[in-house]
């Protein structure tokens, strides 16, 4: 049990103890949510105190202060997903429609997602906000007719399901054009019932 002497400058539990070189001893670190209020000596172990409101320490530490909680910066495109606690900093993420453009241990700056052009959609990612859109083509039988960061490819209209006949097949950028079976001229509107 700390404190105890250490000649080789290493401690038995690296996570929860640290080497104090002045006394050549191993002392306890303070648990998450606390800080060192009194340093250890040969006869007394570290004394810890709870972090004050609006401050935190995330790890086992031998810091003499707690870190100040910082809000998520909306100017940098960030929003809060979990508040700061004594044991954890404020959890931030990119606002909807944005992705992380600068990373330094955590996201520091978000930017607007790129539009995907007609005929494409954003490839689905494991984690929202992780990277910019990578636009991929619509699968066969699907279309997407806008420039948008979030539009999804939709299946082509099946004219027969609406009792209509196909006037022009769909492409990646346009829906199937349907017409009434009795119509001879192709209509101007796509994927809709025209009388």
């Amino acid at each position: 049990v700390p404190p105890y002497g250490s000649e080789n400058q290493t401690c038995r539990d690296q996570e929860k103890e640290y080497y104090e070189p002045r006394h050549r001893i191993c002392c306890s670190r303070c648990p998450p949510g606390t800080y060192v209020s009194a340093k250890c000596s040969r006869s007394r172990d570290t004394v810890c105190a709870t972090c004050a409101e609006n401050s935190y320490n995330e790890h086992w530490n031998y810091l003499t202060i707690c870190q100040l909680c910082r809000p998520c910066d909306p100017v940098m495109g960030l929003e809060e997903i979990a508040p700061c606690t004594s044991k954890r900093k404020t959890q931030c993420r990119c606002q909807p429609g944005m992705f992380c453009a600068a990373w330094a241990l955590e996201c520091t700056h978000c930017e607007l997602l790129s539009d995907c052009p007609p005929g494409t959609e954003a490839e689905l990612k494991d984690e929202v906000g992780k990277g910019n859109n990578h636009c991929v083509p619509c699968k066969a039988g699907h279309f997407q007719n806008t420039s948008s960061p979030s539009a999804r490819c939709q299946p082509h209209t099946r004219c027969e399901d609406q009792g209509l006949v196909e006037a022009a097949p769909g492409t990646a950028q346009s829906d199937t054009t349907c017409r009434n079976p009795s119509e001879s001229l192709p209509p101007e509107m796509s994927g809709t019932m025209l009388m």
């Epitope: 790129s114 539009d115 995907c116 052009p117 005929g119 494409t120 490839e123 689905l124 990578h134 636009c135 991929v136 083509p137 619509c138 699968k139 066969a140 420039s147 022009a168 097949p169 492409t171 990646a172 950028q173």
Partner: antibody
Framework: EVQLLESGGGLVQPGGSLRLSCAAA????????MTWVRQAPGKGLEWVSL????????YYADSVKGRFTISRDTSKNTLYLQMNSLRAEDTAVYYC?????????????????????WGQGTTVTVSS | DIQMTQSPSSLSASVGDRVTITCRAS??????LNWYQQKPGKAPKSLIY???SLQSGVPSRFSGSGSGTDFTLTISSLQPEDFANYYC?????????FGQGTNLEIK
Amino acid sequence: EVQLLESGGGLVQPGGSLRLSCAAAGFTFSSYPMTWVRQAPGKGLEWVSLISPSGATTYYADSVKGRFTISRDTSKNTLYLQMNSLRAEDTAVYYCAKNHYPDDVIIKNYYFYGVDVWGQGTTVTVSS
Amino acid sequence: DIQMTQSPSSLSASVGDRVTITCRASQDISNYLNWYQQKPGKAPKSLIYAASSLQSGVPSRFSGSGSGTDFTLTISSLQPEDFANYYCQQTHTIPYSFGQGTNLEIK
């Protein structure tokens, strides 16, 4: 210099399987979509399959859908085409190709611009 | 699916001639049209992308034009090394289809 080198072709019986490989060099493999194109003896080019840079999105010609699987291993800079339930009509030279992305394009979409580099091809013969 | 039709299927010409090959799409494909050259026993070579943009390293005697459904590949002055098969390909809508090819041979 950008290079693509296919391997894995050969003679296989109908119903059999084969895995083609395409080793890529000279470019950032993980940044580009990749394509397989085939050419039956004395015939024209036929688009077979396409894979996105991440490998998460894949596309197939109707003639191979459900039988062929395209994949990629970024750590090995290699593109694959797993071919199952092979038929006589799958006999062809198979080319892998790198999709083109022109420098002057504003909207980053590699898929509209075809391919710019081709491998030398590997021959697959399906016959009993 | 979008069908690509090339014409002519074969063409005889002489060195120095101006040659035009056409490609027609069954639907509007904007300018998402590419041209490839292939010599017998060799892999295809990319010539033109986006209907009219030359791939790097391709001689300027090759040019492409068109938009929508009708496209052309023009070789302004045929060289001996230009005798080959030429293919167009649309990259507008999956599946990305090729034309049937045009065989350009020496007259």
